[in-house]
């Protein structure tokens, strides 16, 4: 038995920040779980990990270069990524493991979310129009 994960197909980070919501076919209330966010088609780079426990606050771990926070919903974990750079544009996959209560469960691979980080570009000021020629 596998947990299904739904993610937005694409998110655009205009202000170098984005909320990526991972929605699960499983209620996380009063569960001990590990939710994680992985970068790249092969999910090779784990960028955020959230541990949830019925008796403690969420514990959020971030990879160097990623400023990550997590928020828990009944059937979701939302990863809040800040200070993103253009070169962190990529596809990101949500993963979930539930440890307690038994049985241990994990997820079917999701379709992922493409996060497109828009660079901060200064808008060029319009040129001062010169005198029009007759």
């Amino acid at each position: 038995n596998k947990i299904l994960v739904k993610q937005s197909p694409m998110l655009v980070a205009y202000d170098n920040a984005v909320n990526l919501s991972c929605k699960y076919s499983y209620n996380l209330f009063s569960r001990e779980f590990r939710a994680s966010l992985h970068k790249g088609l092969d999910s090779a780079v784990e960028v955020c990990v959230v541990y949830g426990n019925y008796s403690q606050q969420l514990q959020v771990y971030s990879k160097t270069g990623f400023n990550c926070d997590g928020k828990l919903g009944n059937e979701s974990v939302t990863f809040y990524l800040q200070n993103l750079y253009v070169n962190q544009t990529d596809i990101y996959f949500c993963k979930i493991e539930v440890m307690y209560p038994p049985p241990y469960l994990d997820n079917e691979k999701s379709n992922g979310t493409i996060i497109h980080v828009k660079g901060k570009h200064l808008c060029p000021s319009p040129l001062f129009p010169g005198p029009s020629k007759p």
Epitope: R34, E46, V49, Q59, Y61, S62, K63, Y104, D106
Partner: nanobody, 121 residues
Framework: DVQLVESGGGVVQPGGSLRLSCAAS????????MDWYRQAPGKQRELVTG???????NYADSVKGRFTISIDNAKNTVYLQMNSLRPEDTALYYC???????????????WGQGTLVTVSS
């Protein structure tokens, strides 16, 4: 069974430094996370910092910029470098680890006995 052994505690003056170590031993598949908690007299145990085997980190606001955590996966050991120590850092520091005892998934949480850090002039 899995054992966690802390070392490196002691007495240090305000502004000084200490380096704590926590080594995991026994029979297990892999380590997920290794964390440091602390408990001061009459206070609740609080999370100080933690690290995953992949090097992802987590710091309490009160220690950011002063404490640095690192992990040596080959030695199953976590290190806590504590700089600019303050009297309010005085506490018993406990190591905690989420450890996978088999490759089939799931983890268990283990605790060490603690090492005392006293910051006093």
């Amino acid at each position: 069974d899995v054992q966690l052994v802390e070392s490196g505690g002691g007495v240090v003056q305000p502004g000084g430094s200490l380096r704590l170590s926590c080594a995991a031993s026994g029979s297990f598949f892999s380590i997920d996370t290794m964390d440091w908690y602390r408990q001061a007299p009459g206070k609740q145990r609080e999370l100080v910092t933690g690290v995953t085997s992949g090097g992802l980190t987590n710091y309490a606001d009160s220690v950011k910029g002063r404490f640095t955590i690192s992990i040596d996966n080959a030695k199953n050991t976590v290190y806590l470098q504590m700089n600019s120590l303050r009297p309010e850092d005085t506490a018993l520091y406990y190591c905690s680890a989420r450890i996978r005892t088999s490759g089939g998934g799931g983890w268990s949480t283990y605790w060490g006995q603690g090492t005392l850090v006293t910051v006093s002039s």
